[in-house]
């Protein structure tokens, strides 16, 4: 005898809305194999059973959320086989408030999902980023859980809302920050972003005279949540073009970190160098668009790194990891400006 | 120079209010977000309550959550604390701190003032 | 809620020895983390933060270091007035929490 469940999976993650179909099937050597599905609120029509296999439409509706039965038997043989279906909602609704940061004040980003199930805050989870790290130094005050206000009733989806106190965003401010909110489910992994411009001002207010506004730092772990193998990732990110900003240079904290320098001579190559000893080796981890697209040079504790054809290297972060220890520093560059080096 | 100086605890019994005052001096109090903290006796240190420079933000602990308020006067540079429904278990020193913004720590505090619930 | 948790409860020392005390945080805190002295009846008094820097007028002997979920904070060479009890805080995300504390004794 053969038993089998399609999908396979022991959990199913269905997004609201949508269709799912699992067949259990049968085979059997003395006869017809009875399946059927139990312990789900299967109303009718939801449940189609033919000789030898049993198919469990799901429709993506809360309800269906729970954890169905395949049971099949031929002769005195039986199995059985449950899968956890969980239905989620996670729509790209995202509100940032303020819609842009003025730098140089003390001041509160929020963001809110909207229209969330799960309402778990193990399932959800919120960054604030600056490129592609999480923001450093920005300290998270309590999340808020509301529910939705719902036209039809039996749907109780929420909106979650994180705020966070912005450190000081140094000078020259960043173009923006990203708010990113990221649902992990069985075997998928979900983002949403949505993009917070920093106002790019000649006259950006000082901060308190009894502060003093330090630049702002980049960690260097990647902001990737809880990704492993067998994992979806799916990204929806907002990426608008930034505004023009002189080159910014940023870095992880740590005693050694490798330093970039822009050459105009070979078309706008880039160097990314370290000097903390013997056996440190860096190479370049990210830059706008795909770093498979640049040419690369790599030999020990030197990178270079370069647009292909020559020309003008490409708006946007360009990033240098140096190993062991894996600090980062981060470049800017912006459309067309004079070239100079990292500090 | 900066100064944090607590007033207002006192004895008090179950169920009873008391109002907790920090007058602030030496710096621009509209510019920091306050703490309260507090230290039971013998006892570690339990952060309370915060408030933002402008009062939009307020938040709790859930041990004081529904019992107790902050507020803050900026032309009083004074920072409150409104204790209700109090228990036996808010004993302790009351300190108001200062937050440095942007970075979120707290470095300077008062000197404490005593609260202590009993019957 | 994020867990902070030190070691030793207490230690007893003497003038002159390098003392160590370790912070733990139940999840990662970056660098947003301090450090306090608090002797009996006074409020507590800022050493260390950011992990790592020594706030204004503190003395050189203490030093703080670590990141993440590991912390520790160091007096290199302990003197009659560092008898005391030290706290660890992060301030990372709200509730902020502080570790239990450690008091340092003379031996």
């Known amino acids: 005898q053969s038993f089998q469940v399609n999908p396979p999976e022991s959990e199913v993650a269905v997004a609201m809305g949508t269709s799912l179909q699992i067949t259990c099937s049968m085979s059997c050597d003395e006869g017809v194999a009875r399946v059927h599905w139990r312990g789900l609120d299967t109303s009718l029509g939801s449940v189609q059973t033919l000789p030898g296999s049993s198919i469990l439409s799901v429709r993506g509706m809360l309800s269906d959320t729970g954890t169905p039965v395949c049971v099949g038997s031929c002769g005195s043989r039986s199995f059985q086989h449950s899968v956890k279906i969980l239905v989620y909602a996670f729509p790209d609704q995202l509100v940032v408030s303020p819609e842009f940061l003025v730098p140089g004040q003390d001041q509160v980003v929020s963001c809110t999902a909207h229209n969330i199930w799960p309402a778990d805050p193990n399932s959800l989870s919120f960054a604030l980023l600056l490129g592609e790290q999480r923001l450093e130094g920005a300290q998270a005050l309590e999340p808020e859980q509301e529910e939705e206000i719902q036209e039809a009733e039996g749907t109780p989806l929420f909106r979650m809302t994180q705020r966070w106190r912005l450190p000081s965003l140094g000078t020259p401010a960043p173009p923006a920050l990203h708010c990113q909110v990221t649902m992990q489910l069985p075997k998928l992994v979900l983002t949403h972003r949505k993009e917070i411009p920093v106002l790019q001002s000649q006259t950006s207010p000082k901060p308190p005279n009894t502060t003093s506004a330090e630049p702002y730092i980049l960690t260097s772990s990647s902001t990737a949540e809880a990704v492993s193998t067998g994992l979806n990732i799916t990204t929806l990110p907002s990426a608008p073009p930034y505004p023009k900003l002189s080159p910014r240079t940023l870095s992880s904290e740590g005693p050694c970190r490798p330093k970039i320098h822009q050459d105009l001579e070979a078309g706008w190559e880039l160097l990314c160098e370290a000097s903390c000893g013997p056996g440190v080796t860096v190479r370049w981890t990210l830059a706008p668009g795909d770093l498979a697209t640049y040419h690369k040079r790599e030999a020990g504790a030197q990178a270079w790194l370069s647009v292909l054809p020559p020309g003008p290297m490409v708006e946007g972060w360009f990033q240098c990891r140096q190993d062991p220890g894996g600090e980062v520093t981060n470049l800017y560059v912006p459309g067309q400006v004079t070239p100079n080096s990292s500090s | 120079e900066v100064q944090l100086l607590e007033s207002g605890g006192g004895l008090v019994q179950p169920g009873g209010s008391l109002r907790l005052s920090c007058a602030a001096s030496g710096f621009t109090f509209s510019d920091f977000w306050m703490h309260w903290v507090r230290q039971a006796p013998g006892k570690g240190l339990e952060w309370i309550s915060y408030i933002s420079g402008d009062s939009g933000y307020t938040y709790y602990a859930d041990s004081v959550k529904g019992r107790f308020t902050i507020s803050r006067d900026n032309s009083k540079n004074t920072l409150y604390l409104q204790m209700n429904s109090l228990r036996a278990e808010d004993t302790a020193v009351y300190y108001c701190?200062?937050?440095?913004?942007?970075?979120?720590?707290?470095?300077?505090w008062g000197k404490g003032t005593t609260v202590t619930v009993s019957s | 809620d994020i867990q902070m948790t030190q070691s030793p409860s207490s230690l007893s020392a003497s003038v002159g020895d390098r003392v160590t005390i370790t912070c733990r945080a139940s999840?990662?805190?970056?660098?947003?983390l301090a450090w306090y002295q608090q002797k009996p009846g006074k409020a507590p008094k800022l050493l260390i933060y950011a992990a790592s820097s020594l706030q204004s007028g503190v003395p050189s002997r203490f030093s703080g270091s670590g990141s993440g979920t590991d912390f520790t904070l160091t007096i290199s060479s302990l003197q009659p007035e560092d008898f005391a009890t030290y706290y660890c805080?992060?301030?990372?995300?709200?509730?902020?929490?502080f570790g239990q504390g450690t008091k340092v004794e003379i031996k």
């Open positions: 701190a200062r937050d440095r913004p942007y970075y979120y720590y707290m470095d300077v």
């Open positions: 999840q990662s805190v970056s660098r947003s």
């Open positions: 805080q992060q301030y990372k995300s709200y509730p902020v929490t």
